[in-house]
Interface confidence: low
């Protein structure tokens, strides 16, 4: 398994609507035609898979219909958006990139993006 460098921002603050976006950039050592991007969440030493998408270079990322992730790709950059986040989802979100095809297989794992999610204060009652 050949190593590959993956860069991602250290910290991102989710919007009041629970949406966080960040760029995951990988240093591709070869001309991959098929790339798999996985977002992993690390919290309390537990690692869980948030979402994953395989895409052909030049095409859109396709996540499952019920995925909380969406994304677009441009060259060696993947713009990832995670939706529906709540305060309890605060944690380290790691970008894992695999160059699936053609071989040789390359694997890169970023250092993670700490996503902070603050639940919005409920709106005070209004007369109008």
């Amino acid at each position: 398994c050949k190593a590959m460098h993956v860069a991602q921002p250290a910290v991102v603050l989710a919007s009041s609507r629970g949406i966080a976006s960040f760029v995951c950039e990988y240093a591709s050592p070869g001309k991959a035609t098929e790339v798999r991007v996985t977002v992993l969440r690390q919290a309390d030493s537990q690692v869980t898979e948030v979402c994953a998408a395989t895409y052909m270079m030049g095409n859109e990322l396709t996540f499952l219909d019920d995925s909380i992730c969406t994304g677009t790709s441009s060259g060696n950059q993947v713009n990832l958006t995670i939706q529906g986040l709540r305060a309890m989802d605060t944690g380290l979100y790691i970008c894992k990139v695999e160059l699936m095809y053609p071989p040789p297989y390359y694997l890169g794992i970023g250092n993670g993006t700490q996503i902070y999610v603050i639940d919005p204060e409920p709106c005070p009652d209004s007369d109008f």
Epitope: C1, E34, R36, L40, V47, T48, E49, T54, K96, E98, M100, Y101, P102, P103, P104, Y105, L107
Partner: antibody, heavy 122, light 107 residues
């Protein structure tokens, strides 16, 4: 139904050569990465070789690199494993296996053949 | 290469019992683990991939769990056809390596 049938195993002397074949049916052979996996007499499983869909890319563990060659003929739906400089440690049941994802390179082995036995002994 | 260590190497159980087999990875493999079952004289069959996803046609009494370096395969209410050997295998890059196996025998 996916079917993988291996053949070509047998008894060979140390330093000898052997070519295994695996005939596939029940799926579009050219759409899948294929592999060989072996099981030693002690029942340990070891990945031996992988070849990409078009056959242009191959991968091997250090234990067989330079001695074994995986190839395929998509027109014949057949996978091959050419083994040379065989050693007693190569004695094993050799299985042909298909990866689960047609478009991916490194995953799990979703379908296995019944195996062909290779015995390396003087 | 990532070393995979299975335990126990063998165990005896009765029909109807629940058993758990564990697999430890030499480094973090996240959830990239598969489990296989092999019956005497047969080839291995895929049971679980991605640590917890059951392969097509696998009965729901089988369940996989774990992430990182510690994984387990649980079989609820053992049936006669469940006896045999079980192997774990990481699918976190190449080379894919297997655990040494666990032989499940009838008590």
């Amino acid at each position: 139904d996916v079917k993988l049938v291996e053949s070509g195993g047998g008894l060979v002397k140390p330093g000898g050569s052997l070519k295994l074949s695996c005939t596939a049916s029940g799926f579009t052979f050219s759409s899948y990465t294929m592999s060989w996996v072996r099981q030693t007499p002690e029942k340990r499983l070891e990945w031996v070789a992988t070849i990409s869909r078009g056959g242009g890319y191959t991968s091997y563990p250090d234990s067989v690199k330079g001695r074994f060659t995986i190839s395929r003929d998509n027109a014949k739906n057949t996978l091959y494993l050419q083994m040379s400089s065989l050693q007693s440690e190569d004695t094993a049941m050799y299985y042909c296996a298909r990866d689960d994802y047609g478009s991916s390179y490194v995953h799990w082995f979703a379908y296995w053949g019944q195996g062909t036995l290779v015995t390396v002994s003087a | 290469d990532i070393q995979m260590t299975q335990s126990p190497a063998s165990l005896s159980a009765s029909v109807g019992e629940t058993v758990t087999i564990t697999c430890r990875a030499g480094e973090n493999i996240y959830s990239y683990l598969a489990w296989y079952q092999q019956k005497q004289g047969k080839s291995p069959q895929l049971l679980v991939y991605n640590a917890r996803t059951l392969a097509e046609g696998v009965p729901s009494r089988f369940s996989g769990s774990g992430s990182g370096t510690q994984f387990s395969l649980k079989i609820n209410s053992l049936q006669p056809e469940d006896f045999g050997s079980y192997y774990c295998q990481h699918h976190y890059g190449s080379p894919r390596t297997f655990g040494g196996g666990t032989k499940l025998e009838i008590k």
